[in-house]
Amino acid sequence: SIPWNLERITPARYRADEYQPPKGGSLVEVYLLDTSIQSDHREIEGRVMVTDFESVPEEDGTRFHRQASKCDSHGTHLAGVVSGRDAGVAKGAGLRSLRVLNCQGKGTVSGTLIGLEFIRKSQLVQPVGPLVVLLPLAGGYSRVFNAACQRLARAGVVLVTAAGNFRDDACLYSPASAPEVITVGATNAQDQPVTLGTLGTNFGRCVDLFAPGEDIIGASSDCSTCFVSRSGTSQAAAHVAGIAAMMLSAEPELTLAELRQRLIHFSAKDVINEAWFPEDQRVLTPNLVAALPPSTHRAGWQLFCRTVWSAHSGPTRMATAVARCAQDEELLSCSSFSRSGKRRGERIEAQGGKRVCRAHNAFGGEGVYAIARCCLLPQVNCSVHTAPPAGASMGTRVHCHQQGHVLTGCSSHWEVEDLGTHKPPVLRPRGQPNQCVGHREASIHASCCHAPGLECKVKEHGIPAPQEQVIVACEDGWTLTGCSPLPGTSHVLGAYAVDNTCVVRSRDVSTTGSTSKEAVAAVAICCRSRHLVQASQELQ
Amino acid sequence: QEDEDGDYEELVLALRSEEDGLADAPEHGATATFHRCAKDPWRLPGTYVVVLKEETHRSQSERTARRLQAQAARRGYLTKILHVFHHLLPGFLVKMSGDLLELALKLPHVDYIEEDSSVFAQ
């Protein structure tokens, strides 16, 4: 009778003999910033060290009565979910607890910052193996909280946080909104987003993935062998902290970027019922439920990519939106999306020595999103080749002309307000895989990359009749790096990657009065690295 | 996830160095920004994190904190330095009246100041 949540995160090959994956996480130290905990609970006894750190505000109310079991309840439960003997994810992981939340579960940004500094100082004084920091808390958006998280992450620490229980955009909360932090939303046994009273799990582009967060059995501070069911995004974050500890124990050299990509890669895809989310957040919210890797195998041979959405540009005419990849990731392609369809495309730009994806709003548009495809590719070297608007009926084209460079993505950007008034181009002629084709009024940008053994191919899926959505997926063994629409007419809302599938969205054709001539094609660029495959074969 | 120009309340004070006539005062027209939680009930006025510019030397955190205390005292305000940060961000945590924000934002090396706010178990 394994708890549902442990079963959910466990790949099928472990399930034959109940939940008995390797007692992982033993090389990893997990720091828990929460309430006080009951360290002599049988679930966590001997595997948790209570640090002397405490920075908490006074409890509210004059009549507040401190009761040890209540003060310890939140932290004890989470410690049990991370590494509990029976109901824990990473049964081998060591835990260190810092008290930053009082008996009412309330703390301060400043107290938590001091806690994060305590961790950094400990790391400097006595460097150990991989560190995971679990922040099962949330406050309003805080620049300083996010900045501190960024610094700690850049010092090699993996931070995992709760998305928040406010049934709201996670980007409005910290540390959930910090890009360097792994932000976790909560789902239930039915793979529905968790409802908590009148509220529920947060959502949106600041969430990295979801994990079990309803009716989660874990250590109860009521007695030293008691268990209790609790719900929340804290519980979900604790699962991911446990999975991260398992992965880092198997591969201690993993960087934060590699770990995040693996968490996404091994997640269950497209199982969450998105109807629960507000309509405008569905496309931004990742449909991913965390899971352990199918074994402690080294997944280094894969080309990992993820999709990163920008903040909304806002509606002003010259508004732009910028999507950025993490420090160790490479931006392989850039696309854009607008709900109104009024946009002026996108392009890759250099900013502070890093490539970013910038999308441009159009006059009368409600705003745009930039969508970056961020990948892990060792020794990669990319450049952007641009062709100005051709003005010719064949459309604008650009290709990768440098030796050894392959096409990883196509972007197009136009100055005219409405491409719809201009004749669309024909589809790209076959047999020219290294070429981007776009509207004759648009400048076209090809992302051309060189990396050992990197090979890419273009996959197109065109539908003769107008459709609201056209999709094209990469085959097994190939990873989607680029996703763009053909042609660039006004009824195309944009293109974006969902896992290994390229999605091109068009306006509801019944309302636009479009003709069947305005057919849409989705162009996917699928890549793999022979170099990485060979490296993995040598390992085996 | 979220860029630093995210959806939170920002009060920008473009302040020129004045009366204190400090040798290392900010260059003409330099701006430090003030931030506070957009969710009013979660605000904790009276406690502020003063964040210094990234390249600031670690000894500068104490020096800036002391300078703030001295200038506040000259105006008849009591302040208390609760913590000095060294290992993550250069800066310090200070308990003071909100009346001193304008003064604090003019201090050399200050990048931004954020009012403390609550966080909650999830």
Partner: antibody, heavy 118, light 108 residues
């Protein structure tokens, strides 16, 4: 080796009270806590309460709150069970057992029979 | 309050046969469940702790398994001295110590 020896049982009038003793030997007395458990004739085991000799802290089964009092004398390595307002249904064999809270009751005394009858 | 339900209440078997007793908890208890044996006129004695660990001096024919809510005590081949009453036990918040109703293993 570890030994627990109960005493103090016997015949008690209804409404009366009794004090049972349990002397421990063979280990450090204050390192473990103790439970009192009773068993009515032909019935199962029923837990009464426990004491931590180190701190003197006690916990009781709600059913025995106010009726039973557990105490200890560390100098004598002995713990006690005081039972008041006894009724016929309190007739049982009373056992003391050594434990570590959250673990098992690893050593038991031989038991002492208490009969409540007029 | 956790309720422990033992089944069967009585088990009639012959020496040499295999005995299987189950204990079901009304809520999740992890692996923190213990088994005791009580012979007539004697005090209970600890057999198995933490669901599957044999206590000191307990013969190998006794084994425990299970976790969560469903637990099993197995006696692989009954010896004459094994005919007794068996109890399962867990810890809880109130009351802290909870026993199952007992299973009597009798000679057929």
């Amino acid at each position: 080796q570890v030994q627990l020896l109960e005493s103090g049982g016997g015949l008690v009038q209804p409404g009366g009270s009794l004090r049972l003793s349990c002397k421990a030997s063979g280990y450090t007395f204050s390192s473990y806590s103790f439970s009192w458990v009773r068993q009515a004739p032909g019935k199962g085991l029923e837990w009464i309460g426990y004491i931590d000799p180190g701190s003197g802290g006690t916990k009781y089964n709600q059913k025995f709150q106010g009726k039973a009092t557990i105490s200890r004398d560390n100098s004598k390595n002995t713990l006690y069970l005081q039972m008041n307002s006894l009724r016929a249904e309190d007739t049982a064999v009373y056992y003391c057992a050594r434990q570590r809270v959250g673990y098992s009751l690893d050593y038991w005394g031989q038991g002492t029979l208490v009969t409540v009858s007029s | 309050e956790i309720v422990l339900t033992q089944s069967p209440a009585t088990l009639s078997l012959s020496p040499g046969e295999r005995a299987t007793i189950t204990c079901r908890a009304s809520q999740y208890v992890g692996s923190y469940l213990n088994w005791y044996q009580q012979k007539p006129g004697q005090a209970p004695r600890l057999l198995i702790y933490d669901a599957s660990n044999r206590a000191t001096g307990i013969p190998a024919r006794f084994s425990g398994s299970g976790s969560g809510t469903d637990f099993t005590l197995t006696i692989s081949s009954l010896e004459p001295e094994d005919f007794a009453v068996y109890y399962c036990q867990v810890w809880d918040s109130s009351p802290p110590v909870v026993f199952g109703g007992g299973t009597k293993v009798e000679i057929k």
